[in-house]
């Protein structure tokens, strides 16, 4: 997260880190005791999932292996549409005040809505500085019309933009797949943006979760 702040401890109990060994690979969001939602471009053969701590690499955090993941069937490595994936944990998480599932959206929030994005991604770009603490950034949803002024046809119908005018605050390497939460519901998953990160008036681009609720529910049901 560029130009963000340290998240209030325990305020993001649904936030997970997808690790490759001990190294941060992507963010993710707990949606059920067996399931984590993340970006399709975060796919690996297997994952180590850290839950229940704001500190990356925290020895006291829950760590659960995941060997199965289900990409949206329409994910395109060319256009990056449908950049969403479910990761099935090999064993259920132990829910607590530190580990909770996020609320999936009932509706799509409108432009102008205040949201928070979080992650352990680099706080500097292009040179990287990875924080140990979970970082947050407060951003507002931007209309597709406004966002298309920047990204033109790169912006797909189920992509969502967020940012703050003239501000550098944005997501970056390592934040991928992490949550954009608006009014206590999951509205976005970090997908992409321009590089170096933090160029003012280049919004962060997210997968718009409200458009995928049916796919999420059906996939979890099919593979429970």
């Amino acid at each position: 997260i560029i130009d963000g702040y340290k998240c209030k401890e325990g305020s993001h109990p649904w936030q997970v880190a997808l690790l490759k060994g001990n190294q941060l690979h992507c963010g993710g969001v707990l949606v059920d005791k067996y399931w984590v939602l993340t970006a399709a471009h975060c796919k690996m053969g297997q994952y180590q999932v850290q839950l229940g701590s704001d500190k990356i690499g925290d020895q006291s955090a829950q760590k659960i292996k995941a060997t199965k993941s289900f990409r949206h069937p329409g994910y395109s490595t060319k256009t990056h549409v449908n950049d969403i994936m479910l990761v099935r944990l090999d064993e259920p998480v132990k829910m607590s005040s530190k580990v909770e599932a996020v609320q999936l959206p009932e509706h799509c929030e409108p432009p102008g809505t205040s949201c928070t994005v979080s992650g352990w991604g680099t706080t500097t770009s292009p040179d990287v500085t990875f924080p140990s603490d979970l970082m947050c950034s407060d951003v507002k949803l931007i209309s597709s019309r406004e966002c298309k002024k920047v990204y033109k046809d790169l912006l797909g119908k189920t992509m969502l933009c967020a940012g703050i005018p003239d501000s550098k605050t944005n997501t970056c390497n390592g934040d991928s797949g992490g949550p954009l939460v608006c009014n206590d519901t999951l509205q976005g998953l970090v997908s992409w943006g321009t590089y170096p990160c933090g160029q003012p008036n280049d919004p962060g681009v997210y997968t718009q979760v409200c458009k995928y609720k049916r796919w999420v529910m059906e996939t979890m049901k099919t593979h429970r």
């Epitope: 990056h80 991604g121 770009s125 033109k152 390592g174």
Partner: antibody
Amino acid sequence: QVQLVQSGAEVKKPGASVKVSCKASGYTFTSEGIHWVRQAPGQGLEWMGSISASSGDTNYAQKLQGRVTMTTDTSTSTAYMELRSLRSDDTAVYYCARGAGYGARDWYFDLWGQGTMVTVSS
Amino acid sequence: DIQMTQSPSSLSASVGDRVTITCRASQSISSYLNWYQQKPGKAPKLLIYGASSLQSGVPSRFSGSGSGTDFTLTISSLQPEDFATYYCDQRYSTPPITFGGGTKVEIK
């Protein structure tokens, strides 16, 4: 330091295959994509394809589809490009390059290997 | 696929000259264009990304401009080490990534 180091020059007969390696060091290999670009003698640059080092997702240039395979070995931070059924017009310097970006997209090549000369001759 | 056309294909200039190279896209690519410099026997090196942003460590005599279909690389005062071939590439409609044909800058 941050670098991509490629394997040495190769001489191949028409119809043979070649496999060029590209070893990354000084950065997290799985966080970036690797692209392959070639340059025939005295000619311009031609994009061949790319691979995501973490997921293994590939995109290949249409004209090479079916003849090229790109792979990675994350345990050694090495990318590979194999080209089959070689022809004389495949004679070129082959470069690997790192795609700079984050998330699902990359935007430019900020790091290049030194190049590998592949000569196809009978 | 988007075609990138560079002009001129070669030019002769003297040290201290102002040099301009153009790259034209077959359709609008917004500002998703990069410029690279390549010296004989060496790998290309990034100069400019996003049409106008100077890559770290690149001298300020290099500048880029343009958006849509027409782009320019300018060297304000040519130095002996700038004699090389310059390429543009587009990152708007990818894959494939497409390069311009190159512009060779030679000593007059």
